[in-house]
Interface confidence: low
């Protein structure tokens, strides 16, 4: 993959940008699309062949304070008879999101962005079989 | 999480709520964790509700690359490797926070943005609607 040869120069910083101290950035935590809602199919965590439960984690020094994590209920998957089939595996599906962490150091408060790995749900997979020689 | 006790002599500044605008250290904690779902696992191929990953790119956003899942089938893959339409492949969606440049193109000025991403797919029993 080569850099294409088209007439466009390096990105230049606009003059209208707010001044920011070195080593930091200005972050507005008034969220764009704050009221957007997830339109997932109903109760998929219970109807899935790899069902999961939700746990809410709470941290007042994190923004957002509430982060929901999923945990797979079974090692195997649920078959058509409603029984656990251990020839298949329930595995977590994960996604990264950003949070803002508030840190107290003496009387000063600082803010740090942090990537958090959220388990979103589970899926049923065929296991990888390792053959021992 | 752990609440860090404050020095009682400190002025009470935004104790409960976060201020609307904050100055944040440029280094993101856990920034270099590998977030390419194609590299981190092959669940998207091995799942009974397999999905394809589509690259969504926006240079005005961090992260600039987000992978969107699209279920390959309406049904799920059965033990014989065929699509079983008695079951449904459905996307698992998640709201995530990203950074949006504000004003546009500025190097160190951002606003949090909530976006909805499909992370993967799962196989579910369909909801059957009986017609009276």
């Amino acid at each position: 993959r080569k850099i294409p040869k088209v007439g466009h120069t390096f990105f230049q910083k606009p003059e209208s940008c707010p001044p920011v101290p070195g080593g930091s950035m200005k972050l507005d935590i008034g969220i764009i699309n704050e009221n957007q809602r997830v339109s997932m199919s109903r109760n998929i965590e219970s109807r899935s062949t790899s069902p999961w439960n939700y746990t809410v984690t709470w941290d007042p020094n994190r923004y957002p304070s509430e982060v929901v994590q999923a945990q797979c209920r079974n090692l195997g998957c649920i078959n058509a008879q409603g029984k656990e089939d251990i020839s298949m595996n329930s595995v977590p599906i994960q996604q990264e999101t950003l949070v803002v962490r508030r840190k107290h150091q003496g009387c000063s408060v600082s803010f740090q962005l942090e990537k958090v790995l959220v388990t979103v749900g589970c899926t049923c997979v065929t296991p990888v079989i390792h053959h021992v020689q | 999480g752990i609440t860090i006790p404050r020095n009682p002599g400190c002025p009470n500044s935004e104790d409960k709520n976060f201020p609307r605008t904050v100055m944040v250290n440029l280094n993101i904690h856990n920034r270099n964790t590998n977030t390419n779902p194609k590299r981190s696992s092959d669940y998207y191929n091995r799942s009974t509700s397999p999905w394809n990953l589509h690259r969504n790119e926006d240079p005005e956003r961090y992260p600039s690359v987000i992978w969107e899942a699209k279920c390959r089938h309406l049904g799920c893959i059965n033990a014989d490797g065929n699509v079983d339409y008695h079951m449904n492949s459905v996307p698992i969606q998640q709201e995530i926070l990203v950074l949006r440049r504000e004003p546009p193109h500025c190097p160190n000025s951002f606003r949090l943005e909530k976006i909805l991403v499909s992370v993967g797919c799962t196989c579910v029993t369909p909801i059957v609607h009986h017609v009276a």
Epitope: I3 | N32, T35, N36, R39, P59, H105
Partner: nanobody, 119 residues
Framework: ESGGGSVQAGGSLRLSCAAS????????MGWFRQAPGKEREGVAA????????YYADSVKGRFTISQDNAKNTLYLQMNSLKPEDTAMYYC?????????????????WGQGTQVTVSS
């Protein structure tokens, strides 16, 4: 890319990457390297609109990434080179604000220049 070559441990090299342009406003430029039999790893990255560069822990204090907007050129000054720095070095460009040292964040790649450090 240019500027690669063979050097003794403790020596220096300066890599250059001349870019002709982009299909969209490129925000990140980075240097990556790949040693034989190893995965490609990020070395250093810079946001072309300003701000602090990022470095892999293994090169901090020894390598410096810089840019010359007038010449549309990216540089990597490599000092105190070690045998473990031996690799093919690639220049890369892509979008994104933080310019992380993760290769799939970068869309455009150079052909690479070989750096060999002998003890």
């Amino acid at each position: 890319e240019s500027g690669g070559g063979s050097v003794q441990a403790g020596g220096s090299l300066r890599l250059s990457c001349a870019a002709s342009g982009w299909t969209f406003s490129t925000l990140c430029m980075g240097w990556f390297r790949q040693a034989p039999g190893k995965e490609r790893e990020g070395v250093a990255a810079i946001y072309t609109g300003g701000g602090s560069p990022y470095y892999a822990d293994s090169v901090k204090g020894r390598f410096t990434i810089s840019q010359d907007n007038a010449k549309n050129t990216l540089y990597l000054q490599m000092n105190s080179l070690k045998p473990e720095d031996t690799a093919m070095y690639y220049c890369a460009a892509g979008g994104g604000g933080y310019c992380p040292l993760i290769d799939y964040e970068y869309n455009y790649w150079g052909q690479g220049t070989q750096v060999t450090v002998s003890s």
